[in-house]
């Protein structure tokens, strides 16, 4: 039988034999022989039949050196089997054994759950010699016990290479419930069921769980741990916690917020980072995600022009990074831009709209009717053209770029000239005689260089030739005009 020591307020007197019934104490200490100092509470024995030999782990009877008589078997005396006490209390327990004086160098070690207790543990061994035997008491004390002190403690003694093992002393440290699993914060869809889990352990068991929602208990009667709370659905945010009860009191879990997923808030702070003739780079600050991750965003672009049809261009993009380059825009145009983002619930409202403008574009057409001829001095080539019909969005004409390429006997050389916007003719110096000169002209605005005209070729003869006939860009067409003199 296991004697159970339990917490009890009154002290027990010294008692030479088995104590009746069970005992609960918070200051348990076991003793069978006089102690060196101080008050010593009672020794608690397992109730065994008097005179009955102990048949546990014993040392085999031995013959003395004289061979005259058998020694009795060596065994630890019975002691309390089970000590129950509250956390943070002190406990002291011991094991005792009487060893014939013929044995030398006896040592007692303490073991917990199969592992030897070494080092800082508070263990004391006391020896009480007599004529024939020495009584040995090994005491083990723990101050301010914790749950980690729970376990089975035994004494071991080595004599002549044999091991004697005591009965186990089970220490059970009781306290408030300890959570092994607490509810977790969640984001849930409105009116959709979800589960929360709570688990706590003693000792003492059982541990019972009450659920609390927004400071109100959900269940009138507790559930044994572990408990799963099924919430049928919420329409607004709620805070849940669980309370774990045992016979020592109750412990409250952390409160967890259960959020209701909603559409996101609109993005804020839409900013323009860079504008070109046909694109605008924007960024935005995402709004609150509505407790559900953003999936993607939509950039909405409206042209601000009384003559435009007011249609909205929509560009879909990923939610991250919070940046998008809007392309395929017209040059020198005003746009109103807004951003909206979505999560699994739906789209946010559109951000505050911002105004942005594209810059001037480059001309979209080349100068017309390009004509090239060699002047009388034969030192210059005259070039003439007509101003291109550029759109307003291309911006103001600032000039022309003339490309002339000289090819002679396997050598090719390109030169570029810039002329002002008021010109419609130019003169370039002959670079090489007995060579072909290919001329192309492009209009230039602040927005950039437009397309070059189709090439016009003229042959520059060696000195002494007399032809001044012009070469010109033919009327619309892609032929490669060349003038051979």
């Amino acid at each position: 039988a296991i004697t159970e020591a339990r917490e009890e307020a009154k002290p027990y007197p010294l008692f030479p034999g088995p104590l009746p019934g069970s005992l609960q104490t918070d200051h348990t200490s076991l003793l069978s022989l006089p102690h060196t100092s101080g008050y010593q509470p009672a020794l608690m024995f397992s109730p065994t039949q008097p005179g009955r030999p102990y048949t546990g782990n014993v040392a085999i009877p031995r013959v003395t050196s004289a061979g005259s008589k058998l020694l009795p078997p060596l065994a630890f005396k019975h002691t309390v089997g089970h000590i129950i006490l509250s956390e943070h209390k002190d406990v002291k327990f011991n094991c005792s054994i009487s060893v014939p004086n013929i044995y030398q160098d006896t040592t007692i070690s303490w073991w917990k759950d199969g592992k030897e207790l070494l080092g800082a543990h508070h263990a004391i061994t006391q020896f009480y010699p007599d004529d024939e035997v020495t009584a040995i008491i090994a005491s083990f004390s723990i101050t301010s016990v914790q749950r980690s002190d729970n376990g089975s403690y035994i004494c071991k003694m080595k004599i002549n290479n044999e091991e004697i093992v005591s009965d186990p002393i089970y220490i059970e440290v009781q306290g408030l419930p300890h959570f092994t699993k607490q509810p977790e914060s969640m984001n849930v869809t409105r009116n959709t069921a979800f589960n929360l889990t709570c688990q706590a352990v003693g000792p003492p068991e059982p541990v019972n769980i009450f659920w609390v929602q927004n400071s109100s208990r959900v269940n009138e009667q507790p559930e044994k741990s572990p408990s799963v709370l099924t919430v049928p659905g919420l329409t607004e945010m709620a805070v849940f916690s669980c309370e774990a009860h045992n016979d020592k009191g109750l412990t409250v879990s952390k409160g967890v917020q259960i959020n209701i997923k909603a559409i996101p808030s609109p993005p804020t702070e839409v900013s323009i980072h860079n504008s070109t003739a046909h694109s605008i780079l924007i960024s935005w600050v995402p709004g609150f995600d509505g407790y559900s991750p953003f999936r993607n965003c939509s950039v909405q672009v409206k042209e601000v022009d009384p003559l435009s049809n007011g249609s909205v261009m929509i560009f879909n993009t990923s939610a991250s990074p919070h940046m998008y380059q809007i392309k395929q825009l017209q040059a020198l145009a005003n746009y109103s831009i807004g951003v909206s983002c979505m999560n699994e619930i739906g789209w946010s409202a559109v951000s505050p709209w911002i105004l942005a403008s594209t810059t001037e574009g480059a001309p979209s057409v080349a100068p017309l009717n390009v004509t090239v001829f060699l002047n009388e001095s034969r030192d210059n080539v005259d070039i003439r053209w007509m101003k291109p019909l550029t759109k307003r969005q291309a911006g103001e004409l600032v000039g022309y770029r003339i490309s002339h390429v000289w090819q002679s006997a396997g050598i090719s050389k390109e030169l570029l000239e810039e002329v002002g916007q008021n010109n419609s003719r130019a003169q370039i110096s002959v670079q090489v005689h007995n060579a072909t000169c290919t001329v192309r002209i492009a209009a230039v605005t602040k927005g950039g260089v437009g397309p070059f005209s189709d090439p016009v070729k003229i042959f520059i003869p060696a000195h002494g030739w007399v032809d001044h006939a012009p070469s010109s860009t033919p009327a619309p067409g892609n032929a490669d005009p060349v003038l051979i003199i």
């Epitope: 068991e205 009450f210 609390v212 507790p222």
Partner: antibody, heavy 114, light 110 residues
């Protein structure tokens, strides 16, 4: 729904022993600790004893020598005995859930008189 | 012997807010005293309002809330109604026993 119902004698004589029974329904006594509380006429509530889920007990220290609380989990009953009754023990006796004093019986009124 | 003290009486106007308190003779009230608040109308059994970790009993409206204010347990009733007129008892747990206060008689004026 958890309900508690007290039963016992309406009248006891001085020096006699009072035995009260609390019958619990809707829950097992292995998961509910039960306390006994009394209220003399026109006075405040007074806690008497608790029996824990594991069977352990605690008592009002001023009345401990006269009180015994026990339970029969299979019958879902908690029994309180109070010895050496005196007229000052005249009161309504309630049983209630322990950590939350929020499930109460309707009470049983006991008069101590010769 | 620990004594738990409550205000003997208190009055509140309909719709008003009132805070009843509960003091321990042994020092500050803490969460480990598991302050319970019980409402009792004359001739009726008590009804638990707040218990454990200041959580409301099932069915108790959120006009009732429990807390620890300074070194005392407190019961706050917001939006007081005529049927809140009752006796209110607090109970504190001291390691192995409950101690009830003497009760507060709450009157709702008008």
């Amino acid at each position: 729904q958890v309900t508690l119902k007290e039963s016992g004698p309406v009248l006891v004589k001085p020096t006699e022993t009072l035995t009260l029974t609390c019958t619990v329904s809707g829950i097992s006594l292995s998961s509910f600790a039960i306390s006994w509380i009394r209220q003399p006429p026109g006075k405040a509530l007074e806690w008497l004893a608790v029996i824990w889920t594991g069977g352990g007990t605690d008592y009002n220290s001023a009345l401990k020598s006269r009180l015994t609380i026990s339970k029969d989990t299979s019958k879902s009953q908690v029994v309180l005995t109070m010895t050496n009754m005196d007229p000052v023990d005249t009161a309504t006796y309630y049983c209630a859930s322990h950590w939350y004093l929020d499930v109460w019986g309707q009470g049983t009124t006991v008069t101590v008189s010769s | 012997q620990t004594v738990v003290t409550q205000e003997p009486s208190f009055s509140v106007s309909p719709g008003g807010t009132v805070t009843l308190t509960c003091r321990s003779s042994t020092g500050a009230v803490s969460t480990s005293n598991y302050a319970n608040w019980v409402q009792q109308t004359p001739g009726q059994a008590p009804r638990g309002l707040i218990g454990g970790a200041n959580s409301r009993a099932p069915g108790i409206p959120d006009r009732f809330s429990g807390s620890i204010l300074g070194n005392k347990a407190a019961l706050t009733i917001t939006g007081a109604q005529a049927d809140d007129e009752s006796d209110y008892y607090c109970a504190l747990w001291f390691s192995n026993h409950w101690v009830f206060g003497g009760g507060t008689k709450l009157t709702v004026l008008g």
